[in-house]
Each structure stands twice: as C-alpha cells, then as structure tokens.
C-alpha cells in the first residue's frame, strides 16, 4: 500500500519519478509533470520532451509539447512541467490577433511619419505622424528618412499551434 502524497512531500526529484501512487483517490489530483491513471488511483509521469502538465490536475493525458515553427527560435525546451517557449526570429513578430505565424517587421515608416517603437518578437515597429509628435524623445528628423527597426530581445511563450 502506498503512502499518501501531499504537495509538500513532493521534492523536485520525486516529481520527475516515472510513477507516483496515491492512497487517497478521493483527493483526485496529480502533481505537475504527471497525469491521472484511468482508474484514478495512480499518477503517471509525462514523457520528457513529448508532453507536460503545469498544475495539479486530474487529466487523463498530459498536454503535447509545442514544437517551434520554422521562423521561430526555441528559447527553452519542453519539460514534464513546462511547455516549450518559442520566439519569433529577429526581425519578425507575432501579433495577438494572429498568433499562428511570425510576420516580418516593416523596415521603416511611411513618408510623413517617424518611428517611435522598435520591432520586437511581439510587435511591429510603431510609427506616428510627425505633426502629432512622438511618444518618446519628441525629436523629429530634420530630413525625410526611412528609419530602420532594431530587433527586441524579450521572450514570449509561443502559441499553442504546433
């Protein structure tokens, strides 16, 4: 008969164990990195690099790890307790309303506008009309020019589409 496992009892190395048994199925939850067995009596480890679970759960199956698309870089790999973190490659971005693919950032602003925000992995360059002023320094280029963007560095988790 297995001993009752509480959340406090689970050291990191135990969470990575292939199988965890619970003596109290009425509690009904398995720790991150595991899913529940069909009969609700056991906690079964997710497969490293293949699937994961992030919270205490009663899931029948672990969630599939995201695979970064072409045009993305993998910032951190999938573990049994955390999904892959993907980021758009330098010079591209992913919008919230179209998360399925990275799009190329514009290389500059249209005539009569100035750049006030750089290309980042989650946003295109930001342009404003000269007349309306700028959001940052307030400087306006003296001559008409196309301002090229520089890539940002912060990371963002990738979309769930694999």
């Amino acid at each position: 008969e297995s001993a009752l496992i509480t959340q406090q009892d689970l050291a990191p190395q135990q969470r990575a164990a292939p199988q965890q048994k619970r003596s109290s199925p009425s509690e009904g939850l398995c720790p991150p990195g595991h899913h529940i067995s069909e009969d609700g009596r056991d906690c079964i480890s997710c497969k490293y690099g293949q699937d994961y679970s992030t919270h205490w759960n009663d899931l029948l199956f672990c969630l599939r790890c995201t695979r970064c698309d072409s045009g993305e870089v993998e910032l951190s790999p999938c573990t049994t307790t955390r999904n892959t973190v993907c980021q758009c490659e330098e010079g591209t971005f992913r919008e919230e309303d179209s998360p399925e693919m990275c799009r190329k950032c514009r290389t500059g602003c249209p005539r009569g506008m100035v750049k006030v925000g750089d290309c980042t992995p989650w946003s295109d360059i930001e342009c404003v009309h000269k007349e309306s002023g700028t959001k940052h320094s307030g400087e306006v280029p003296a001559v008409e020019e196309t301002v090229t963007s520089s890539p940002g560095t912060p990371a963002s988790p990738c979309s769930l589409s694999g």
């Epitope: 699937d51 009663d58 899931l59 029948l60 199956f61 969630l63 589409s161």
Partner: nanobody, 124 residues
Framework: EVQLVESGGGLVQAGGSLRLSCAAS????????MGWFRQAPGKEREFVAA????????YYVDSVKGRFTISRDNAKNTVYLQMNSLKPEDTAVYYC?????????????????WGKGTLVTVSS
C-alpha cells in the same frame, strides 16, 4: 481552430457493429486529445472514450470497455470509434471533441472543439 464532422451513425440491430469517424480540419489536429461523448434522449451528455495526442493512451467508460475501441490517424486528421456488441442502451447521438486533454470526468481542458454529432440507433 479545428472543425470536426462525425459520420458513420445509423440503425443497427443489437449485437451488431458500427464504426464512427470524426474528420478534423486544421493543421493542429495532432496536438489535441480526442474524445467521444454521447447523449441519449432525455439524458445528459456522457463521456465515452478518449485518447491522447499520439494515440498511445486511451480511456473508456466502464459501460463500453471491451466493446468499443477508439483510435486515430494523424495523417488523415481522423479519429474513429469502433463499436461492437452494440446494445439498445448505446442508442444516442455521438459527438466527437478535441481538447488539450480531458479530465477523469470528461471535462475538456484548454480550448475545446465539438462536432454536431451522428445518431446511432440500436434496435432490439
């Protein structure tokens, strides 16, 4: 976004067999766990069977164990429910569902998508 369309339902005599299919559109089909649910007239929707994204793990409700088999073909974006030794109490509309996973009680986890259902009638 995943669209699901069930087919294969019909009228069958008790003891007979049917194979339901659920065709999915969308390139992310293989990311999802798939489940079959059923709703008999005047009853609540019931969790019947499910399998994980790879097809390597399956779940069946006790009442269908040994009679029903769930499987998937990720290359064809299709999930199947092979139903043998059918009983009149299996009569219901059968629904296909896709989700990140399913809880032990059949609750979908994450975004979930549902088909419109296919009717299975088992006569005695």
């Amino acid at each position: 976004e995943v669209q699901l369309v069930e087919s294969g339902g019909g009228l069958v005599q008790a003891g007979g067999s049917l194979r339901l299919s659920c065709a999915a559109s969308g390139r992310t089909f293989s990311n999802y766990a798939m489940g079959w649910f059923r709703q008999a007239p005047g009853k609540e929707r019931e969790f019947v069977a499910a399998l994980n994204w790879s097809g390597g793990s399956t779940y069946y409700v006790d009442s269908v164990k040994g009679r029903f088999t769930i499987s998937r073909d990720n290359a064809k974006n299709t999930v199947y429910l092979q139903m043998n030794s059918l009983k009149p109490e299996d009569t219901a509309v059968y629904y296909c569902a896709a989700a990140g996973s399913f809880s032990l009680g059949g609750r979908p986890y994450g975004d979930d998508y549902w088909g419109k259902g296919t009717l299975v009638t088992v006569s005695s």
